[in-house]
């Protein structure tokens, strides 16, 4: 058993049929010594008396808010949550496996630049009695500070018969050094509580590996005289790190016909313009990637050819 | 070339070669096949590789103030990785394909380090840790770890030379 926060405790249980459970001793936070009784949740049934209560925690029915009273007055509370371990593996019932970029991906994180700011998100099908708390650090043995905000519900989607809820959180490294080569990864820890079930999820990454620039901005076409060619120009996204002479991007320009089956013409360039042939009914798209490190491409910015 | 007394390196040449190094480092370690899956243990790690850290003056402001600190750090790293790529870790079993980019990568690391340091002048170089794993799987794992950290190192070096070529070239 360990303390999650004041008066909230997590009991770690091996979860299998007829498991013996864990013996837990609760102590009433009071100078009083006698006349103390204990109850669980809203029930008025007295579970025991005395300053301490010993219980055998085996299942969710044994978890909940234990309260000690004296003469009708509440002295203190202890909320017990359960953390299930099945076949030696902690349960992951609360969050949905996003399966991208690989199986068992519960947390996904992205950064728009090298400022030390990043966003993580996760999915669940649970709509009520759900709380999240997020902590982060750079490195784990001698951790350096990363400050995370509160997790918020950022999207709701209908998937077949189910509703899916996306939560996200923004974090900022306290003393970020955008130009340095990271040697210690960022660690993100999410505590999830659904009713009386506790779970924790972690992710470890370098900012350089989660970089995904915003799409190029101000995408424009300029027809070239007496030619089917056009000059496409664009600018670095506002959110990208500066100066651009240092934090450089490379770009992919694509000409795509109306039909998905039509051959795509692609050009790669480090410049912020390119000359391409504009076919009728086609569109021109541009995306960006860090020039020197192969992290994710941005989403496409697109304009119609016409 | 970076020489004592602080004269400038051939920024544009360094920019071109460092960008080539980035491409080679990624082609030498594509994340594919069963090797992309998981790493087996951490018996032999690459914690001792030189990193370009916050205080090394490799940020735009630090380069403007005095690029020598940063260039020395980059040079140190280039020599370190050049020695690793020439060691038994990469030459032993399992053998690389004959036209593997590792050979070119090795030569390019040497080329860039020579651009930064003329003959007859020696910056301090970092000691290479004595990594000589006995098992082929340990060597293979170590190769991937080295190449992965090299990708990060050369990315920073390439940014430095690109910025230098754009803003510090005579």
């Amino acid at each position: 058993i360990w303390e999650l926060k004041k008066d909230v405790y997590v009991v770690e249980l091996d979860w299998y049929p007829d498991a013996p459970g864990e013996m837990v001793v609760l102590t009433c936070d009071t100078p009083e010594e006698d006349g103390i009784t204990w109850t669980l949740d809203q029930s008025s049934e007295v579970l025991g008396s005395g300053k301490t209560l010993t219980i055998q925690v085996k299942e969710f029915g044994d978890a909940g808010q234990y309260t000690c009273h004296k003469g009708g007055e509440v002295l203190s509370h202890s909320l017990l949550l359960l953390h299930k371990k099945e076949d030696g593996i902690w349960s992951t019932d609360i969050l949905k496996d996003q399966k991208e970029p690989k199986n068992k991906t519960f947390l996904r994180c992205e950064a728009k630049n090298y400022s030390g700011r990043f966003t993580c998100w996760w999915l669940t099908t649970i709509s009520t009695d759900l709380t999240f708390s997020v902590k982060s650090s750079r490195g784990s043995s001698d951790p350096q500070g990363v400050t995370c905000g509160a997790a918020t519900l950022s999207a709701e989607r209908v998937r077949g018969d189910n509703k899916e809820y996306e939560y996200s959180v923004e974090c900022q490294e306290d003393s970020a050094c955008p130009a340095a080569e990271e040697s210690l990864p960022i660690e993100v820890m999410v505590d999830a509580v659904h009713k009386l079930k506790y779970e924790n999820y972690t992710s470890s990454f370098f900012i350089r590996d989660i970089i995904k620039p915003d799409p190029p901005k101000n995408l424009q076409l300029k027809p070239l005289k007496n030619s089917r060619q056009v000059e496409v120009s664009w600018e670095y996204p506002d959110t990208w790190s500066t100066p651009h002479s240092y934090f450089s991007l490379t770009f992919c320009v694509q000409v795509q016909g109306k039909s998905k089956r039509e051959k795509k013409d692609r050009v790669f360039t480090d410049k912020t313009s390119a000359t391409v042939i504009c076919r009728k009914n086609a569109s021109i798209s541009v995306r960006a990637q860090d020039r020197y490190y192969s992290s994710s491409w941005s989403e496409w910015a697109s304009v119609p050819c016409s | 070339r970076a020489v004592p007394g602080g004269s400038s390196p051939a920024w544009t040449q360094c920019q071109q070669l460092s960008q080539k190094l980035c491409t080679l480092a990624w082609s030498a370690h594509p994340l594919v096949g069963h090797m992309d899956l998981r790493e087996e243990g951490d018996e032999e790690t690459t914690n001792d590789v030189p990193h370009i850290q916050c205080g090394d003056g490799c940020d735009p402001q630090g380069l403007r103030d005095n690029s020598q600190f940063c260039l020395q750090r980059i040079h140190q790293g280039l020599i370190f990785y050049e020695k690793l790529l020439g060691s038994d870790i990469f030459t032993g079993e399992p053998s690389l394909l004959p036209d593997s980019p590792v050979g070119q990568l090795h030569a390019s690391l040497l080329g860039l380090s020579q651009l930064l340091q003329p003959e007859g002048h020696h910056w301090e170089t970092q000691q290479i840790p004595s990594l000589s794993p006995s098992q082929p799987w340990q060597r293979l794992l170590l190769r991937f770890k080295i190449l992965r950290s090299l990708q990060a190192f050369v990315a920073v070096a390439a940014r430095v030379f690109a910025h230098g070529a754009a803003t510090l070239s005579p």
Partner: antibody, heavy 118, light 111 residues
């Protein structure tokens, strides 16, 4: 040395699922992938899927996604494969094999012969 | 899925001679640095045994008369000089992408 112990044989009724075991010893069980491979009598080898014991991440051959469920018990260093609704097509030898960075199936168990018969 | 076609299906070789087994992949299983290609030997009633990994590297404890070569789509296993104990079925396997697949096998008979 690395050892993967599998029961020699399992007789199973059609439609009654069967759970095959593979007990690992001689190495750190949570450090590498455990693969499962099928071999029908007198036939070739088919890769079913694999599981990483550290967090139970699985990768399954699409052909077997509705047939095989892979699990592990870290406390006993044992990998399991459950075959659902077995038919005569599932009668085969099933091997577990430890993957390494050099090759995906380096160390093999002796195999369990599953016979599906009424 | 990548299909591996092994040839011949069976092979008879005299003691001391060379046995050559080929395997062709339906698409390249190599990157710029490695070929994700392996050879196994299987004897009746036994599990397969890894002989060659990453196309040309001899697994520890395997006799030096076994050698592997090739890259891209075409790979070869050579055994020279063949010994009695080499009578077995040989399988190729790739691990370039999921799912890993095996060749159909080549049965080697020693005459």
């Amino acid at each position: 040395q690395v050892q993967l112990q599998q029961p020699g044989a399992e007789l199973v009724r059609p439609g009654a699922s069967v759970k095959l075991s593979c007990k690992a010893s001689g190495y750190s069980f949570t450090s590498s992938w455990m693969n499962w491979v099928k071999q029908r009598p007198g036939q070739g080898l088919e890769w079913i899927g694999m599981i990483h014991p550290s967090d139970s991440e699985t990768r399954t051959n699409q052909k077997f996604k509705d047939k095989a469920t892979l699990t592990v018990d870290k406390s006993s260093s044992t990998a399991y494969m459950q075959l659902s609704s077995p038919t005569s097509e599932d009668s085969a030898v099933y091997y577990c094999a430890r993957g390494m960075i050099t090759a995906p199936t380096v160390y093999w168990g002796q195999g369990t012969l599953v016979t599906v018969s009424a | 899925d990548i299909v591996l076609t092994q040839s011949p299906a069976s092979l008879a070789v005299s003691l001391g001679q060379r046995a050559t087994i080929s395997c062709r992949a339906s698409k390249s299983v190599s990157t710029s640095a490695y070929s994700y290609f392996h050879w196994y030997q299987q004897k009746p009633g036994q599990p397969p045994k890894l002989l060659i990994y990453l196309a040309s590297n001899l697994e520890s404890g395997v006799p030096a008369r076994f050698s592997g070569s090739g890259s891209g789509t075409d790979f070869t296993l050579n055994i020279h000089p063949v010994e009695e104990e080499d009578a077995a079925t040989y399988y190729c396997q790739h691990s370039r992408e999921l799912p890993w697949t095996f060749g159909g096998g080549t049965k080697l008979e020693i005459t």
